[in-house]
C-alpha cells in the first residue's frame, strides 16, 4: 500500500482500514515505512512519533484537558471533548475525561428529543392529564398516554375532542361509541 | 449544491420585531426539518429553533420561546422567523440551516444576517 503519511487528523476510513489490516491487532503501519507495525496509543493518549523499528515503543502523550481519545489510536491529536448545549436545556451527567468524552442528558421528568441525529433537546415528560399513563417516559422517549373518552392523542397530549376539526385524523378517535345492538319489539313481530 | 440565502435582518430597538427569510435551493426542501441558529459576536454558535418538514411541529429554545416563531412555505422553498419583543442579548448573525449536525459542529461558513438590537 502507498502510505498515507498519517500527518491529518484522522486518515480517511478506507486508507485507515488498509493499513491496519496489514498489521495484527493493536498495531499499525510505520506512517512512512510499511514494512513497520508499530503499537497503537492506549485510549486516553495520542501518537506524538511512530515506533523508529519494530519492538521498539512508539511515542505516545497523554490528551490535554479538554481532548480525549476513547479507544486504541494512532492519531496525531486528541479529539475535542462535546460541550452539553445550554440553549437545549441539556445537563452534563459526566465530565470529559482523557479516554471519554462528555455525556450530556436531561433532568430528571425529562426526555431527549432528537432534533438532528446527534443534537437532541431536553423536553419535559407529558402528565397525561385528561388520560393514563400506559408506557413512562424514557430517556429518548415522551410518555405513551391513554386519553379518557371525550379526548384525543395530539403530539403526546389528550387534547378536548372539541378542538378536532373535520377531516382530521382525530375524528376516528373522536366518534362516539356506537350504540350496543338493541332489537326494537316492533321489529320483531311476524308480518 | 444546498444554498441558503438569509435575509431581513437590520437595525431594531428592544422590544421591537423583525421576521428573518431564508430561501433554498439546491436540494428538496418540503422533505427536511429546518432550523435557525444564531452566533452572538463572541461567542459559539447557539441553537435557535427547529421546523419538521410539513411545518406541523416546531421547537425552540427556552430563550426565545414566546417571542419567536419558526414557520415554512414549501410551495416557495422559503424558511421564515418571525422575531418579536426582541431584546439586546437577541443581537447575533442569524443562519438558517438544513444539516444542524454540520452547523453545530463546525464553525459556520454561511453568510448569515445580522440582527442588532439597540437603543
Known amino acids: 500500500i502507498h502510505p498515507s503519511g498519517v500527518t491529518g487528523l484522522v486518515p480517511s476510513l478506507g486508507d485507515r482500514e488498509k493499513r491496519d489490516s496489514l498489521c495484527p491487532q493493536g498495531k499499525y503501519v510505520h506512517s512512512k515505512n510499511n514494512s513497520i507495525c508499530c503499537t497503537k496509543c492506549h485510549k486516553g493518549t495520542y501518537l506524538v512519533s511512530d515506533c523508529p523499528s519494530p519492538g521498539r515503543d512508539t511515542v505516545c502523550r497523554e490528551c490535554e484537558k479538554g481532548t480525549f481519545t476513547a479507544s486504541q489510536n494512532y492519531l496525531r491529536q486528541c479529539l475535542s471533548c462535546k460541550t452539553c448545549r445550554k440553549e437545549m436545556s441539556q445537563v452534563e451527567i459526566s465530565p470529559c475525561q482523557a479516554d471519554k468524552d462528555t455525556v450530556c442528558g436531561c433532568k430528571e421528568n425529562q426526555f431527549q428529543r432528537y432534533l438532528s441525529e446527534t443534537h437532541f433537546q431536553c423536553v419535559d415528560c407529558s402528565p397525561c392529564f385528561n388520560g393514563t399513563v400506559t408506557i413512562p417516559c424514557k430517556e429518548t422517549q415522551n410518555t405513551v398516554c391513554n386519553c379518557h373518552a371525550g379526548f384525543f392523542l395530539r403530539e403526546s397530549e389528550c387534547v378536548p375532542c372539541s378542538h378536532c376539526k373535520k377531516n382530521e385524523e382525530c375524528m376516528k378517535l373522536c366518534l362516539p361509541p356506537p350504540l350496543a345492538n338493541v332489537t326494537n319489539p316492533q321489529d320483531s313481530g311476524t308480518a | 449544491e444546498v444554498q441558503l440565502l438569509e435575509s431581513g435582518g437590520g437595525l431594531v430597538q428592544p422590544g421591537g420585531s423583525l421576521r428573518l427569510s431564508c430561501a433554498a435551493s439546491g436540494f428538496t426542501f418540503r422533505k427536511y426539518d429546518m432550523h435557525w441558529v444564531r452566533q452572538a459576536p463572541g461567542k459559539g454558535l447557539e441553537w435557535v429553533s427547529t421546523i419538521s418538514p410539513s411545518g406541523r411541529r416546531t421547537y425552540y429554545a427556552d430563550s426565545v420561546k414566546g417571542r419567536f416563531t419558526i414557520s415554512r412555505d414549501n410551495s416557495k422553498n422559503t424558511l421564515y422567523l418571525q422575531m418579536n419583543s426582541l431584546r439586546a442579548e437577541d443581537t447575533a448573525v442569524y443562519y438558517c440551516?438544513?444539516?444542524?449536525?454540520?452547523?453545530?459542529?463546525?464553525?459556520?461558513w454561511g453568510q448569515g444576517t445580522l440582527v442588532t438590537v439597540s437603543s
Open positions: 440551516a438544513e444539516n444542524l449536525d454540520q452547523v453545530l459542529s463546525f464553525d459556520y
